[in-house]
Interface confidence: medium
Amino acid sequence: HNTTVFQGVEGQSLQVSCPYDSMKHWGRRKAWCRQLGEKGPCQRVVSTHNLWLLSFLRRRNGSTAITDDTLGGTLTITLRNLQPHDAGFYQCQSLHGSEADTLRKVLVEVLADPLDHRDAGDLWVPGESESFEDAHVEHSISRSLLEGEIPFPPTS
């Protein structure tokens, strides 16, 4: 599996999507887990509804929510109020019995320009004139990352 990078802005929401073959994974619940170290286990964060037919219902664990479009074949995870400690490697999984297939490997990156939070009147670098009206708009960027392109970061 290649790793897909999703970038979100600190304090905002980040939406991660994991497409899959809806026929191949028919009847299977899904999960979102955090990779603990390069060779370590993937620790479950949140999983879809216990009843597969109700997978479209949003389930939440803290600031992380999951919902599954089983017909369209898209698992969606939302990380609210993104924080620096949310950065790291994750997996979207398809569950069957005690086994789990990886649907997508994900690297979450948290972006935060420290001048962004200042209101225009509070900036003390004269000449700063960016508009901050849209500072709380949900924003995400994703791109594909080849396996091994970025060294595995130490877990905190």
């Epitope: 972006l111 320009d113 939070h117 003390w124 960016e130 708009v137």
Partner: antibody, heavy 114, light 112 residues
Framework: EVQLVETGGSLVQPGKSLKLTCATS????????MHWVRQSPEKQLEWIAH??????????YYAESVKGRFTISRDDSKTSIYLQMNSLKEDDTAIYYC?????WGQGVMVTVSS | DTVLTQAPLSLSVTPGESASISCRSS???????????LYWYLQKPGKSPQLLIY???NLASGVPDRFSGSGSETDFTLKISEVETEDVGVYYC?????????FGPGTKLELK
């Protein structure tokens, strides 16, 4: 006039603690994320910690090299920030700067040596 | 971590001539609203760093307009159109987009 003045630097033994203070004036302190950046004897700059504003619940973040040992805090009423440094190592020897990233203090020397 | 690489690491320039310093980032520094979070600082001998350029191309307060910043998502350039004696020191690029925030190794500018 913007001013940032760091104090509290000294020569300490490995394993000991030290607290740095940065007193500021001349800018809207309470709205600004404040940072500590250090400069090693080799002149490399390293960002080590920051603390956000009250509106951000004074959230803090640290570089891996100091996480669990250093604590950043602020007192808006005194327009000051602090850096509590515990379990100091020889690698922590550096000039420590207080900064809002646009303006910087003059720096304070911390030497960790036995 | 986001690694910043500078070139050259030292530079000797005749007063009145132009100078150019390059900074390359291991990751894109393009954030939201097309803001690129690349900053340039000058540290004069015995002094603390002073901000020259913020968000890739914006001139900081009080900085002479002979300084300019440009670049793309990962490759950046600081240009000094006519070097003066007061420009001597070490120039650092820095990124304030991804944690941990990082600085380049510095480029030492001296006069011929």
């Amino acid at each position: 006039e913007v001013q940032l003045v760091e104090t509290g630097g000294s020569l300490v033994q490995p394993g000991k603690s030290l607290k740095l203070t940065c007193a500021t004036s001349g800018f809207p302190f309470s709205n600004v994320w404040m940072h500590w950046v250090r400069q090693s004897p080799e002149k490399q700059l390293e960002w080590i910690a920051h603390i956000k504003a009250k509106s951000d619940n004074y959230a803090t973040y640290y570089a891996e090299s100091v996480k669990g040992r250093f604590t950043i805090s602020r007192d808006d009423s005194k327009t000051s920030i602090y850096l509590q440094m515990n379990s100091l190592k020889e690698d922590d020897t550096a000039i420590y700067y207080c900064t809002g990233l646009d303006y910087w203090g003059q720096g304070v020397m911390v030497t960790v040596s036995s | 971590d986001t690694v910043l690489t500078q070139a050259p690491l030292s530079l000797s320039v005749t007063p009145g001539e132009s100078a150019s310093i390059s900074c390359r980032s291991s990751k894109s520094l393009l954030g939201v609203r097309d803001i690129t979070s690349l900053y340039w600082y000058l540290q004069k001998p015995g002094k603390s760093p002073q901000l020259l350029i913020y968000r890739m191309s914006n001139l900081a307060s009080g900085v002479p307009d002979r300084f300019s910043g440009s670049g793309s998502e990962t490759d950046f350039t600081l240009k000094i159109s006519e070097v003066e004696t007061e420009d001597v020191g070490v120039y650092y690029c820095a990124q304030f987009l991804r944690y941990p925030y990082t600085f380049g190794p510095g480029t030492k500018l001296e006069l011929k």
